[in-house]
Structure formats: C-alpha cells, structure tokens
Interface confidence: low
C-alpha cells in the first residue's frame, strides 16, 4: 500500500517527585519500520532512559506504537521527540504550560 | 568543513539595541541545537542562550532573559540575537556554536570566531 | 543553578610532563560535562565531551574522567602547543555554566 504519514501525539503525566513521565505515540502509519525517540539537547537518549511499546496494527491496516521517558519538571524545553517514518522525519516538543498534550500530523 | 561566522557586533550605548547574527554552513543546520556563549573582558565564559533544531524552544540565562531573543532561520542557515536594553556588563565577545548533536549534550563542538560588543557611554 | 569550581586556576609545568585539572560540579551531573581548549587569540575548541570521549582530532594524550560531581582532564606528555586556557562546561541542566578556567604555562 501506499505510505501513510504518522500523526504524533506528545502527552506529559502528573508530577511525582519532581519528575514527570512524557510519552510520544505515533498512530495511524504505514509501512511499520518507524523511528520513534526522545531526543535532549538534539541528542538520542540512552535505550535504557526510555520504554518502547510494540510496533502494533490499530485495526485500520495502520500501525501505532509510543515512547516513553522520565524527566525532571522544568526541564520540558529540552526535550524533543523525534520521529523518522519513511523518508519523513521531525520533532516534536514536550507541551509546555497547561496543555499536556500535542498532535501533529506528518505529510 | 563546519563554519559558523558571526556578525553585527559594534559599539553601543547603555540601553540601546543590537542584532547579531551567526551564519552556519558545512553543516544540516536545521538538525542541530544552537548556543550563544559570551566571553567577557575577564576571559570568563559564560553562556547566553539555546535554540532547539526545529525552533521551538529557547533557554536563557538569568542575566539576558527578557532583553536578549534567540532566533533561527532553518531556509537561511543563519542563528540570530537580538539584544536590546544593553548595560555594560553584556560587554564581551559574543560566540555562536553549534550543539553536538550525536555526541552528548551540552557539548558545543563547533565555535565561530565570534563578534565583539562594547557597551559604552 | 549548578556551580563548576574548577581547579587549579594556573599551573605551570615542563614540556614532557603530565598534569591534571579538576571541576567540581555542586550536584550531580552524571556524564554531562565537556571540556575546552582555548590558546591565546583564539577561540575555544572542545576536546572532551561527555566527560571522557575524546571529540575529532584532539590528540590522545588529552583524556578526561569522571562521573557525578568530580571531573578532571589529564595531558601527559605536555607539548609546546598545549599552552592554552581550559575550561570545563556542565551540560546536565539549565542554566549551562563554564568553570573559571585554568590557565597552563610552561615553565
């Protein structure tokens, strides 16, 4: 089938301990090979800084899948998550003040 | 060959207003964090501001935040300051970098040869 | 705000010898220091990043140490050429701040 962009989707968890938990999941896309990470300073974090779920079909033919971190609160400007689906890639900020969550859709 | 040159700096009074610019090549600019770093006239380093490779986020320091913009133009290749409300403690060598990318954060791995401002009556 | 003390502030040493220099971070900064060559009349030049990787170029006898909040850089076999001051810069959090430097001469 033909190439079908990711919609990405960045969403922050409640604070505990100074620390917040921000997961990127990308939806809806196809072929599955998907490049999905949380970036800091424009730099990959380590594998074993974040939890990756399974490259998984969403009924549609589509796939969808996330990734997830634990930063400190107050350090969201750092963080980016960077997405690389078929030629198309881009980043995608941690949402800032009250909106906890981002959606983007790539084209 | 990474090159980042920097321009726009000069002498400028108390208050007044300056815009430098750091114009980047050998290099996929827009993959890439970029830093003002400051050097004073006492040789201490200290660093003046962050932008993220897509733009959106920036990061000051307590000293210019509310008076100093960090900006970029991906399409130009060019990394921007613009300074305004100057008092003579911003008086320094002004330097661009470039973030290190696949190497580890908070290391700048490319400098410019930077721009001067004076900050004088 | 993470303070760097860095230590000596000079040294002077013969050409064959080795020296080290130490920052000491106020908290915790894992791996995430880098460290600076600057020679007189030019600008700074990274040798050290992520507190021992040595960055394109640099020449092997410059190496770095370190993790949590003690750091330190080692030339062995100092050589003419590596009359410079040294600065070490934490990367760990905003606001990203240098050490004061350490300026080496020969004797």
């Known amino acids: 089938g033909s190439t079908v962009p990711p919609m990405v989707n960045v969403t922050c968890s409640e604070v505990s301990e100074g620390n917040i938990t921000v997961t990127c999941r990308a939806s809806s896309f196809y072929p599955r090979n998907i490049t999905l990470t949380w970036r800091q300073d424009g730099v990959s974090l380590s594998h074993n800084t974040q939890q990756w779920g399974d490259v998984l079909p969403d009924g549609n033919g589509t796939y969808q899948t996330w990734v997830a971190t634990r930063i400190r609160q107050g350090e969201e400007q750092r963080f980016t998550c960077y997405m690389e689906h078929s030629g198309n890639h881009g980043t995608h900020p941690v949402p800032s003040g009250n909106s906890h969550h981002h959606h983007h859709h790539h084209h | 060959e990474v090159q980042l040159v920097e321009s726009g700096g000069g002498l400028v009074k108390p208050g007044g207003s300056l815009k430098l610019s750091c114009a980047a090549s050998g290099f996929t600019f827009s993959d890439y964090y970029m830093y003002w770093v400051r050097q004073t006239p006492e040789k201490r380093l200290e660093w003046v501001a962050t932008i993220s490779d897509g733009i959106t986020y920036t990061y000051y320091s307590d000293s210019v935040r509310g008076r100093f913009t960090i900006s970029r133009d991906n399409a130009e290749n060019t990394l921007y300051l613009q300074m305004s409300s100057l008092k003579s403690e911003d008086t320094a060598m002004y330097y661009c970098s470039k973030g290190g990318g696949s190497t580890a954060r908070g290391a700048l791995d490319f400098w410019g040869q930077g721009t001067s401002v004076t900050v004088s009556s | 705000d993470i303070q760097m003390n860095q230590s000596p502030s000079s040294l002077s040493a013969s050409l064959g010898d080795t020296i080290t220099i130490t920052c000491h971070a106020s908290q915790n900064i894992h791996v995430w220091l880098s460290w600076y060559q600057q020679k007189p009349g030019n600008i700074p030049k990274l040798l050290i990043y992520?507190?021992?990787h040595l960055h394109t170029g640099v020449p092997s006898r410059f190496s770095g140490r370190g993790s949590g909040t003690g750091f330190t850089l080692t030339i062995s076999s100092l050589q003419p050429e590596d009359i410079a001051t040294y600065y070490c810069l934490q990367g760990q959090s905003y606001p990203l701040t240098f050490g004061s430097g350490t300026k080496v001469e020969i004797k």
């Open positions: 992520g507190a021992s």
